[in-house]
């Protein structure tokens, strides 16, 4: 990640469109995180990002539990929170943000999904009063197209993030497919 | 400077295992993921499994279930077995580093080591 | 799987020639292609990552291009020590595959 004190600021929310009509129950299930980009996200020049999966689960109050499995330390870490519904379909805010020490803004919009293969997702948070912001692309299976990820490439750039803030993750054998 | 050596048995009889050792100096073997690839003789070059920095692995889909990856940092070697081998698995082994992040390139290799599975 | 094929599997050329290698993918693998050199005594060396750019201390008169489907490795001013076999690999799509080879050989 990119420790640096200058950080690409986060793009106006105009920029970012937002999934019409979007269907909640649909979005459901297990997604990998086939691409990610973001302010402080950095191609390193050695071993890539590894791939992680996330789970949005439905409950009955429309919030979303969210869990992201991802290998670290040599074992499988879980890392579990909970999206609420915001202003509009498609847009949510994080559930008990007080109990994330320096965090004081944070916000999810699904930019465009087809629910079944792919998605991409924007976040934004403000964390000891800096803003940071990420896109992620999702699909169902490990592998999407050399056209999604193309796209993905150009709505990241369109946002402000050069090419070496936009990584593929590299699937792995462990946790993801648990 | 940068260094693979690969260390094998040669000769590995129908339906047993083959172990493989590379041994890498120059680098440690907690920044860069090692892969394993192979070229059995007249065909294209084959890759097999790689061990990442962190411990993950990234294996061929259509060999997992006969590959297994390990290694010790500590030691710098990163140990590769093979189950179940047959003639067609006669090939030249190779280990070799990875670099370039998701541009999944491998910037050093090993000289290979020769395995032929015969009775 | 992705098959890349490399349809001159020897060329044979003089020195100080400009030669160029093809390497084609089965589908489109966005630039996602390395380039490789494999000398007669067996070692293997990286040359290019990522279609163009060159791995450190690869000399300039190597160079890569394409897109898509398509890719092309270059050689201007061909060496005496640049008689190897070149080969290609596809980082887009697991598994990651090679292509055959292409063997320069001295007229």
């Known amino acids: 990640q990119d420790s640096t004190s200058d950080l690409i600021p986060a793009p106006p929310l105009s920029k970012v469109p937002l999934q019409q009509n979007f269907q909640d129950n649909q979005f459901q299930g297990k997604w990998y995180v086939v691409g990610l980009a973001g302010n402080a996200i950095l191609r390193e020049d050695k071993d890539p990002q590894k791939m992680y999966a996330t789970i949005y689960e439905l409950k009955e109050d429309k919030s979303y539990n969210v869990t992201s499995v991802l290998f670290r330390k040599k074992k499988c870490d879980y890392w579990i929170r909970t999206f609420v519904p915001g202003c509009q379909p498609g847009e949510f805010t994080l559930g008990n943000i007080k109990s994330y020490p320096g965090l004081t803004s944070y916000l999810v919009r699904v930019v465009s999904t087809n629910y079944n293969q792919h998605a991409m997702v924007f976040f934004k948070k403000v964390s000891q009063n800096r803003e940071y912001f990420k896109i992620t692309l999702y699909g169902r299976t490990k592998e999407l197209t050399s056209e999604l990820k193309e796209n993905f490439i150009r709505f990241s750039k369109s946002l402000g993030l050069p090419e070496n803030h936009i990584v593929f993750p590299v699937p792995i054998d462990q946790c993801i497919d648990g | 400077e940068v260094k693979l050596q690969e260390s094998g048995p040669g000769l590995v009889a129908p339906s047993q295992s083959l172990s493989i050792t590379c041994t890498i100096s120059?680098?440690?073997?907690?920044?860069?993921?090692i892969h394993w690839l192979r070229q059995p003789p007249g065909k294209d070059l084959e890759w097999l499994v790689v061990?990442?920095?962190?411990?993950?692995?990234t294996s061929n889909s259509a060999l997992k279930s006969r590959l297994s990856i390990s290694k010790d940092n500590s030691k710098s070697q990163v140990f590769f077995k093979m189950s179940g081998l047959q003639t067609d698995d006669t090939a030249i082994y190779y280990c070799?580093?990875?670099?370039?992040?998701?541009?999944?390139?491998?910037?050093?290799w090993g000289p290979g080591t020769s395995v032929t599975v015969s009775s | 799987d992705i098959v890349l094929t490399q349809t001159t599997s020897s060329l044979s050329v003089s020195l100080g020639d400009r030669v160029t290698i093809n390497c084609r993918a089965s589908q489109d693998i966005s630039n996602y292609l390395n380039w490789y050199q494999e000398k007669p005594d067996g070692t293997v060396k990286l040359l290019i990552y990522f279609t163009s750019r060159l791995h450190s201390g690869v000399p300039s008169r190597f160079s890569g291009s394409g897109s898509g489907t398509d890719y092309s490795l270059t050689i201007t001013n061909l060496e005496q020590e640049d008689i190897a076999t070149y080969f290609c690999?596809?980082?887009?799509?697991?598994?990651?595959?090679f292509g055959g080879g292409t063997k320069l050989e001295i007229k």
């Open positions: 070799a580093r990875h670099r370039y992040s998701d541009y999944h390139a491998m910037d050093y």
């Open positions: 690999q596809q980082g887009n799509t697991l598994p990651w595959t």
């Open positions: 120059g680098f440690s073997l907690t920044s860069y993921g």
């Open positions: 061990i990442w920095g962190d411990g993950s692995t």
